[in-house]
């Protein structure tokens, strides 16, 4: 669709005569008829296939034509067409004399024609005017013409329809050739796809308007590139949504079981060495001079009764010192100047001569030891208590004070963690070396089956058209991540293309 425009500029008829040679009385009141038709090698009469237009009387004899409306007519003259411009044309311009006000052909005398010109040729669509001048024996006509496209039509032939828009169906303006030029922030064949925030993750993010990044379920962050771990995940991470991959030193479904108590809590005191021995379980190896489960108690060096033969021990800053009884000497009073005659054996020990009476040895009754039977037996020296139990001397016997979770004479027995039925909702309890584990029935989870969980909403494959299904644990629902070209809560609808254009 377009318009052929003809601009009449000047008509010269100095003698004021008709084509027949007869003069006009009083002068030639001149109007024009224009016929636009398809290209003819020889322009001949016949239908004006591209259109016709007439002017009012524009002047008498010789006159210039103004560029605007003149007496109700328009200059340039408009010859609209509703087809593809063919690039060639034929044009007939007739100048007529109007004796009266009625300009209809049937109202004019047959010899009212002043002049007639006919041209033909090629004409491309464009903004530039082509100037022409046609001269006959008695008249001269100067004019210019061009073809331009109607609004919203573009291209070499005015055949491409393009109407700028900024709505749901597209966001674009039109280029001179009729191609779409997307508005900033939009892309796609019809400029319907927003360009998301720069860096927005292709799969995990999307946008409904330019420069935004909306996250699909299970993802977060400015660019939707950080997954959200399983709800309840404490010391874990994820690489896909709702995972819970435990950090080092943590275990369990929610990574909330401490497998590295030593590092996380540093329970051993006074430079002791800590060894992990299971969930929340550890053993401290004390440095010399310290004791207790956490090596929190300072030992006196005299506590080990280093002085023999009844020697008394004195603590010193750099160790200890033995004060020996009469008849004994040495660092620990271990050397004797006595014989059996001096009755050196205490606590009912019996004396035996050695080396022809130069020395002796004491045979001690039960519960006593030492070269002179002077020491009560410390039944805790062999560390008989297992699992970190504390050994206590009780007269002639000993006993073990056990840590929580252990029992038995030597703390060698685990207390059954399952005895108190810790698993909720009918969970099955299993005793483990370092604690317990619950096997939960369907619909429950958690360390003690205390969390009611939904059945996997994606199990029924609710998404169509190869969409990816995510279970949103926070709402017990599924969400479908649609591939390009599909919409709907289950990706069941293909995206409708916008109304088709004429090209």
């Amino acid at each position: 669709s377009g318009v052929f425009q003809l601009q009449l500029q000047e008509f010269i008829n100095e003698r004021g005569v008709l084509a027949s040679g007869r003069p006009c009385e009083p002068g030639c009141r001149t109007f024009f008829r224009v016929c636009l038709k398809h290209f003819q090698a020889v322009v001949s009469p016949g239908p004006c296939t591209f259109g016709t237009v007439s002017t009012p009387v524009l002047g008498t004899n010789s006159f210039a034509v103004r560029d605007d409306s003149s007496g109700g007519g328009r200059n340039p003259l408009q010859l609209p067409f509703n087809f593809t411009w063919p690039g060639t044309f034929s044009l007939i311009i007739e100048a007529w004399h109007a004796p009266g006000d009625d300009l209809r052909p049937e109202a004019l005398p047959p010899d009212a024609l002043i002049s007639k010109i006919a041209i033909q040729g090629s004409l491309a669509v464009g903004q530039n005017w082509l100037l022409d001048e046609q001269t006959s024996t008695l008249t001269r006509l100067r004019y210019s013409y061009r073809v331009i496209c109607s609004d919203n039509y573009y291209g070499d032939n005015c055949s491409r329809l393009c109407k700028k828009r900024n709505d749901h169906f597209g966001h674009y303006v039109c280029q001179p050739d009729g191609n779409l030029s997307c508005l900033p922030g939009w892309t796609g064949e019809y400029c319907q796809q927003p360009i998301c925030l720069s860096g927005c993750h292709e799969q995990n993010g999307y946008c409904s308007k330019p420069a935004e990044c909306l996250c699909r379920p299970g993802w977060q962050g400015r660019l939707c590139n950080e997954c959200i771990p399983h709800n309840g995940c404490r010391h874990g991470t994820c690489s896909t949504p709702w995972q819970c991959t435990c950090d080092e030193g943590w275990g369990g479904l929610f990574c909330d079981q401490d497998l590295n108590y030593c590092t996380h809590h540093s329970p051993c005191k006074n430079g002791a060495t800590c060894s992990n021995s299971g969930q929340r379980s550890y053993t401290c190896t004390c440095r010399p001079g310290y004791t207790g489960v956490d090596c929190e108690l300072e030992l006196s060096e005299c506590d080990s009764n280093p002085c023999r033969n009844g020697g008394s021990c004195k603590d010193q800053e750099d160790g200890y010192h033995c004060l020996c009884p009469p008849g004994y000497y040495g660092l620990h009073c271990e050397h004797s100047t006595l014989s059996c005659a001096d009755s050196p054996c205490f606590n009912g020990g019996s004396c035996r001569e050695r080396n022809q009476g130069a020395n002796y040895a004491c045979e001690c009754p039960p519960n006593f030891t030492g070269s002179n039977c002077e020491k009560k037996v410390d039944r805790c020296t062999s560390n008989p208590c297992a699992n970190g139990g504390q050994c206590l001397n009780r007269g002639p016997s000993r006993m073990c004070r056990c840590r929580p979770g252990f029992t038995g004479t030597y703390c060698e027995l685990h207390v059954s963690d399952c005895a108190r039925n810790p698993c909720a909702h009918g969970g099955t309890c299993h005793d483990l070396e370092n604690g317990l584990m619950c096997t939960c029935p369907a619909g429950f989870s958690g360390r003690r089956c205390e969390v009611r969980t939904s059945i996997d909403a994606c199990a029924s494959s609710p998404c169509f058209n190869r969409a990816t299904c995510y279970t949103d644990l926070s709402t017990d629902t599924f969400v479908c991540n649609c591939p390009y070209g599909f919409v709907g809560s289950r990706c069941e609808f293909p995206v409708g293309l916008p109304p088709s254009f004429p090209w």
């Epitope: 925030l197 935004e212 996250c215 977060q220 950080e226 709800n231 404490r234 926070s474």
Partner: nanobody
């Protein structure tokens, strides 16, 4: 049930300070990015600040940059907003929320919301 409960709002003079808190429950707080959003009377919601799940990355709207500080304590399931050098234009209801969509300047779509706490800056 997810709950976000804001507190710490009140009336303060221009130039004064307030510290807002948001206590979270019903979800694993430490796994989620968090945000503060405010809504002044007769206006739409305006993003104020955001912080990532670990607390290492913080974001601020231009209007509060240098005056407000966002922080979180994942052990206490609590989000904070320290507001200094307050101005009358900071008067609004302040909400904490979990962002699920970002624009060029900050979050603009949210999942969970609190009920809000009123902050009034007036002499």
């Amino acid at each position: 049930e997810v709950q976000l409960v804001e507190s710490g709002g009140g009336l303060v003079q221009p130039g004064g300070s307030l510290r807002l808190s948001c206590a979270a429950s019903g979800f694993t707080f430490g796994n989620y990015d968090m945000s503060w959003v405010r809504q002044a009377p007769g206006k739409g919601p305006e993003w104020v600040s955001a912080i990532n799940s670990g607390g290492g990355d913080t974001y601020y709207a231009d209007s509060v940059k240098g005056r407000f500080t966002i922080s979180r304590d994942n052990a206490k399931n609590t989000l904070y907003l320290q507001m200094n050098s307050l101005k009358p234009e900071d008067t609004a209801v302040y909400y904490c929320a979990t962002p699920r969509g970002w624009g060029p300047t900050g979050p603009h779509e949210y999942g969970y919301w609190g009920q809000g706490t009123q902050v009034t800056v007036s002499s």
